[in-house]
Interface confidence: medium
Amino acid sequence: SAPGEDEECGRVRDFVAKLANNTHQHVFDDLRGSVSLSWVGDSTGVILVLTTFHVPLVIMTFGQSKLYRSEDYGKNFKDITDLINNTFIRTEFGMAIGPENSGKVVLTAEVSGGSRGGRIFRSSDFAKNFVQTDLPFHPLTQMMYSPQNSDYLLALSTENGLWVSKNFGGKWEEIHKAVCLAKWGSDNTIFFTTYANGSCKADLGALELWRTSDLGKSFKTIGVKIYSFGLGGRFLFASVMADKDTTRRIHVSTDQGDTWSMAQLPSVGQEQFYSILAANDDMVFMHVDEPGDTGFGTIFTSDDRGIVYSKSLDRHLYTTTGGETDFTNVTSLRGVYITSVLSEDNSIQTMITFDQGGRWTHLRKPENSECDATAKNKNECSLHIHASYSISQKLNVPMAPLSEPNAVGIVIAHGSVGDAISVMVPDVYISDDGGYSWTKMLEGPHYYTILDSGGIIVAIEHSSRPINVIKFSTDEGQCWQTYTFTRDPIYFTGLASEPGARSMNISIWGFTESALTSQWVSYTIDFKDILERNCEEKDYTIWLAHSTDPEDYEDGCILGYKEQFLRLRKSSVCQNGRDYVVTKQPSICLCSLEDFLCDFGYYRPENDSKCVEQPELKGHDLEFCLYGREEHLTTNGYRKIPGDKCQGGVNPVREVKDLKKKCTSNFLSPEKQNSKSN
């Protein structure tokens, strides 16, 4: 049984009756194939469900799909397959849902082999109605909405053409041929790579990076010898082949590719890769793969320009390009990230940073847990978190770690307690302070989700047997109650709740199996009557984030400021509500050397917080250069950590040194950049 499932727990009274009145079953009139679910808009209650069923015949595969729509968060569904003329929808393209609350949906249909182009069904009224449109091309990718204007769509064709629509897919225009990768930037800008000779694969490393800011009327070549590119926050990254060998190097632009600087990162060879782990408008976490098939690399964190990088974490687990990494942004507390390292003995250990990659430590051992067999010392060990890598290795881990920005401080994850990740069956752990302290929440693996901004946590046991019980907690996982939502157990396939954790509805998906047939079924439970009143001021308490030492005046200071939050008391059983806004009070901290990183040409000796000038850069180090605008080439040795808001206190001043002599770059010069028009 779960910790806290005892008589002393604070019980919610009469919850069985309250939940029974708010449990809605829907049996789908299909054979069991695959099912996909999408939420349309925010707080609209509209859900689209696409079920598909394949019958492999001797000559071809016959497919059938059905489309259902709910407008009450999944309590009732209506079959709307006739709105798409009973057409078979291609599941690999999914349902392309428009940004924000645009109400737009695009479904891509399966068409017969000889047709001139593909077919889509478009809705701009939250899937109440659909319009069929035949395309002048066969799509290779899902339609991509411009983040700024949901009427603007782009798609790549199977012939590598870049197609754009300005009227939500009604009319399409091919704006460029020979395109490998295309992405929307800001302000309706499109970035894409093109090949000149054979193909995307053959020209890898010889691609050109282009930009159009007017949906294809005019173009600008902003990079050559490109291997690939990526966008993160306000940064545009390109990996560029070196002139003299097969290595490549990251270049970065903060002005949409007009000017570039070489990132102070190691170059990589053909078998290695770069990966943007996380990026925002302040900085970027970059993984650089180690040479050889090691399965690990190094995490670097950038300055505010994306140019100067500090080594953040060695031996960072990342299996292969596009492979698995456990790197997780803990969205419930600023500055917190969790990931895994591959230690010298090939065991995998979890590390956490509370200051955006400045320092990494092991996770504190939960007080209510014993060290497992992986621990050398039974009294000293750490919590290790299962994430993407464990899931890819088919360990008994049904879900990755979970955190939500509006459920402040809460992190839920599968884990084991020892010296390294264990392959034994994991338990579920919870932190209520953003990862500083942990408690075992549930015994064994579970599916879990957060509702009502943390007011309710729901969990279902991960089992190969049919299930009919759901667990819920109203006190951040301390005490659990169980509710039998159906007499007839179902084979469970997934928990679904509206993204954003503001909803009070949870849908349990699964299928029933009888001797003759197998059918999809969903149960939607509304917890509104459990949380029967709205939260008031007295239900909240003040919490200082990142607090480790109350005696220290700088307690809670991370990246130059501290934040006090109003948090729901664990014993308060009430609704935060859909409109709940996290209340926080920031206060600025005094600057210390910890608030600065070392600028280009400077480094921190181990166990020293001062930045000292590197000896004259020689050989390989010459490639760690700044390129572009003149001001990049002057430094006072320190640079404020991106996002750091400290004021006063230590203000390191250095004589400005001209580092021009230390700088070379081989990337495209601005004067070589040419504009073209259609």
Epitope: D539, T541, I542, W543, A545, H546, E551, Y553, S571
Partner: antibody
Framework: QVQLVQSGAEVKKPGASVKVSCKAS????????MHWVRQAPGQGLEWMGW????????RYAQKFQGRVTMTRDTSISTAYMELSRLRSDDTAVYYC?????????????????WGQGTTVTVSS | DIQMTQSPSSLSASVGDRVTITCRAS??????LNWYQQKPGKAPKLLIY???SLQSGVPSRFSGSGSGTDFTLTISSLQPEDFATYYC?????????FGGGTKVEIK
Amino acid sequence: QVQLVQSGAEVKKPGASVKVSCKASGYTFVAYYMHWVRQAPGQGLEWMGWINPNSGATRYAQKFQGRVTMTRDTSISTAYMELSRLRSDDTAVYYCARGKRSSGWYEGYGMDVWGQGTTVTVSS
Amino acid sequence: DIQMTQSPSSLSASVGDRVTITCRASQSISSYLNWYQQKPGKAPKLLIYAASSLQSGVPSRFSGSGSGTDFTLTISSLQPEDFATYYCQQSDVSPITFGGGTKVEIK
């Protein structure tokens, strides 16, 4: 060492006001809530409210709402509790007490340091 | 407001006795329950916080347990300096409330 030193005993007439001070030393004053608790002769303990010295935010027990004002002066690490419209049943020992903190939570962990108490007598 | 009910209101015991005081909350307060000791003419002293955590400097003969609504303070072997009044206090929901107290006297 950590201590709270309160002002001396007061004798007041009904309808008057009293202001009790509590000077903190030996710790970072703004990092801990300050609670005020009173105890009538021969009775139990009664919580009046708290002040967050960092922000000046307060929370008062409903019973004292409108009559109590809690303030602080961070420059001299002192908290104040003023009770107005005094009645005879306000005769009590008034304590200031520091709220214990744990991993960021300001409430929920009791009061770990107490002042020596200030006796307030309300009599006509 | 949450009512805190302490029992017994007084008890007589001898040095070396094991003493148990209970405290019941009118609704769940999770583990936000604290215990204090008060001697005549003195300010209260925090013994146990968060239901079971021993405040530093407090002898280990004092222990606390419970969560939700029912809590217990135990003195494993009563010492002469332990004769005092003991109060429980919930600090989970405003207003903070105290129990009525339990007076431990010498038998």
